[in-house]
């Protein structure tokens, strides 16, 4: 387990001629906020697809009002880091999107409107536990520059997050095959143990009392092969010669059931009932107490002082289940009306709503939207009774209907050449320059120019610069 | 269907190194959360575990061999080679690999497994 | 590191007897614990995982029991195949120990 973490340091007009014009005015002030997006590997992913990783939104920046005639600064930023708590091992290669947001803060009906402004994505190598990696993206004429590390939890330590350290109970040295935690050399590895019961065949673990199942194989200790579409039957071991799988004994089949639990299928396994004084999956614990730590997840544990009595696991928001074992899909509720997108961030819920609907279930229907389409992609935003467009990339206009050439500005620098491509524009560079626009001239001695460290971070920091 | 097999020298002089492989088929290494051990028996004696590896390159030893042992994986080639310097008659045994999955410490797969002698 | 101690040495029964093994642990394993069963020129094989899960494709006469330091491995009914060497092992703790093995012969 550990936490991604992401500081914006800004985000503004890039370099180059064709500023963007402020998202905010007089009349409709706005304040700007961050959703970051992860998932695991390097996924071509679109960017409605899961956060498998994680996901997290930033807190409101300060309001901002453009200075009439004044061209767009760096914008105001919300304060704090954007962080994307991981349960399990960090993946060490991941995706990332992270989207820019405006939350205009004129007298609309149902409270503020959000639209995206800017959506940057890439694809990146990163160890857990090292020095914060620097990064500057561009979408469109916006630039947003920033910072990103991952980090182990405790016990959790190493590249990966997946060794798990303790305190050492003598000073000299750790146990028997316990190597000490690097770098915390006053700590121990410890022993990373699955549920019991996972199958030593099927199913692994990445947190201590989990199963994890590896392919073709579920259930809750990974013991039920997961059917296949061409055969009728979703149960038993699979046909050497079909492939198929054939008629095998039934999930409650001798009753798994330990105790005089009584057992019930279940549509992937089965689930035991158990007498008073007994949990666990097959009913094989007894006397489990609240300082038996029965609770995953965070939750809280009451009750259960003695072994006759049963605990109760209160669960933190987002999960479930006796021992808080369940993640909860608060999406599949549906809470957002209208058609709108379900975010569940962990802590919160969003909706990120379709065009002509606000309200922080996509509940308002915003009159002024209807009947009057974006083209191309165009997102069509709510504003003080007239309708407007906040168009995709490489398009403009009232309605979107208008092709912008993103090379007209000339944005590489240096002599560079521009490309036009489905997602922006490519620069390629003169001899002698680097970037993404051309800007880092490349020294003699190998160096490149690279703009200044983040805030935290001394010139003489290790850092990295993609 | 999972299969592996262990090979290398049936006879190793003493303070010699010996180098085995496992070659295994039906999974894979980079398959997350799966590893490959080893484990040795000498002659109408007991079982005792000696390396592992697991998908993530991280590796275990005993520590009663620690310094001996080196694991490492070929994950293209569906292998893991196991090296042991400075042998002795006392590390004469059957070695065998068997596959066994990240937090679930068992042998659940094993190897026919090779019988190493050493002698001068 | 944790000692398996398995008793008896050596056990003998004919078919159609009750076996039953016996492996300590020198501290708790909770429930941690597997049994193997490993004819002449065979490599071991799994049977019991976590004190008392049967493995794939084990019979029902084995089963195993106990949680903590003390486990067993009942044979309800042994058949003529089942005259092995098991030996325990435990999954608790570095490094992984596997028990000295009960004999189990015809008698």
């Known amino acids: 387990a550990g936490v991604f973490e992401l500081q914006i340091h800004s985000f503004g007009p890039g370099p180059g001629p064709g500023a963007p014009r402020s998202p905010c005015s007089a009349r409709l002030p706005c304040r700007l906020f961050f959703r970051v997006c992860l998932k695991p590997g390097l996924s071509e992913e679109a960017a409605e697809s899961p956060c498998a990783l994680g996901a997290a939104l930033s807190a409101r920046g300060p309001v901002y009002t453009e200075q009439p005639g004044a061209p767009a600064p760096d914008l105001p930023l919300p304060d704090g880091l954007l962080q994307v708590p991981f349960r399990d091992a960090w993946p060490g290669t991941f995706s990332f999107i992270i989207e820019t947001w405006r939350e205009e803060l004129g007298d609309q009906i149902g409270g503020p409107a959000w639209s995206l402004l800017a959506r940057v994505a890439g694809r990146r190598r990163l160890a857990a536990g090292g020095p914060w990696a620097r990064d500057i993206q561009r979408a469109g004429a916006w630039e947003l520059r920033f910072s990103y590390r991952a980090r182990c939890e405790p016990p959790a330590v190493g590249t990966a997050c997946t060794r798990l350290c303790r305190p050492r109970s003598a000073p000299s040295r750790c146990g028997p095959g316990l190597r000490p935690c690097a770098p915390l050399e006053d700590e121990c590895e410890a022993p990373l143990v699955c549920r019991a019961g996972c199958s030593p065949e099927h199913g692994f673990c990445e947190q201590p009392g989990e199963c994890r199942c590896l392919e073709g194989w579920t259930g809750p200790l990974c013991t039920v092969p997961v059917s296949t579409s061409s055969c009728l039957s979703p149960r038993g071991p699979s046909s050497a010669t079909t492939g198929c799988l054939v008629p095998g004994p039934g999930p409650c089949d001798g009753n798994p059931c330990a105790n005089g639990g009584s057992c019930s299928e279940t549509p992937r396994s089965f689930e035991c009932t158990c007498p008073r004084g007994f949990y666990g999956l097959r009913c094989e614990v007894s006397g489990v107490t609240c300082a038996d730590g029965p609770c995953f997840n965070g939750g809280l544990c009451v009750g259960g002082a003695d072994p006759d009595s049963a605990y109760i696991c209160h669960c933190p928001p987002g999960f479930q289940g006796s021992n808080c074992e369940k993640r909860v899909d608060r999406c599949s509720l549906q809470p957002c009306r209208n058609g709108g997108l379900c975010l569940d961030l962990g802590h919160a819920l969003r909706c990120r709503c379709r065009a002509g609907f606000a309200g922080p279930r996509c509940e308002h229907d915003l009159d002024d939207c209807a009947g009057r389409a974006c083209a191309n992609g165009g997102t069509c935003v709510e504003g003080g009774g007239a309708h407007r467009c906040s168009c995709a990339l490489g398009f403009g206009g009232r309605d979107c209907r208008e092709r912008a050439d993103p090379c007209a500005a000339r944005p590489c620098a240096h002599g560079g050449r521009c490309y036009a491509h489905f997602s922006g524009l490519v620069c390629a560079c003169a001899p002698g320059y680097m970037g993404a626009r051309c800007e880092f001239p490349v020294h003699p001695d190998g160096a490149s120019a690279l703009p200044a460290a983040p805030p935290g971070l001394r010139p003489g920091d290790p850092q990295r610069y993609l | 269907q999972i299969t592996l097999k262990e090979s290398g020298p049936t006879l190793v002089k003493p303070t010699q190194t010996l180098t085995l492989t496992c070659t295994f088929s039906?999974?894979?290494?980079?398959?997350?959360?799966?590893?490959v051990g080893w484990i040795r028996q000498p002659p109408g004696k007991a079982l005792e575990w000696l390396a592992l590896?697991?998908?993530?390159?991280?590796?275990r030893y005993s520590p009663s061999l620690q310094t001996r042992l080196t694991i490492t994986k070929d994950t293209p080639k569906n292998q893991v080679v196991l090296t042991m310097t400075n042998m002795d008659p006392v590390d004469t045994a059957t070695y065998y690999c068997?596959?066994?999955?990240?937090?679930?410490?068992?042998?659940?797969?094993w190897g026919r497994g090779t019988l190493v002698t050493v002698s001068s | 590191e944790i000692v398996l101690t398995q008793s008896p040495a050596t056990l003998s029964l004919s078919p159609g007897e009750r076996a039953t093994l016996s492996c300590r642990a020198s501290?708790?394993?909770?429930?941690?614990l597997a049994w193997y069963q490993q004819k002449p020129g065979q490599a071991p094989r799994l049977l019991i995982y976590?004190?008392?899960y049967r493995a794939t494709g084990i019979p029902a006469r084995f089963s195993g029991s106990g949680s903590g330091t003390d486990f067993t491995l009942t044979i309800s009914s042994l058949e003529p195949e089942d005259f092995a060497v098991y030996y325990c092992?435990?999954?608790?703790?570095?490094?992984?120990?596997f028990g000295q093995g009960t004999r189990l012969e015809i008698k």
């Open positions: 976590d004190a008392f």
């Open positions: 039906g999974f894979s290494l980079s398959t997350r959360g799966v590893g």
């Open positions: 501290q708790s394993v909770s429930s941690y």
């Open positions: 068997a596959r066994s999955n990240w937090g679930n410490w068992y042998f659940a797969l």
């Open positions: 092992q435990h999954r608790s703790n570095w490094p992984i120990t």
């Open positions: 590896i697991y998908w993530n390159d991280d590796k």
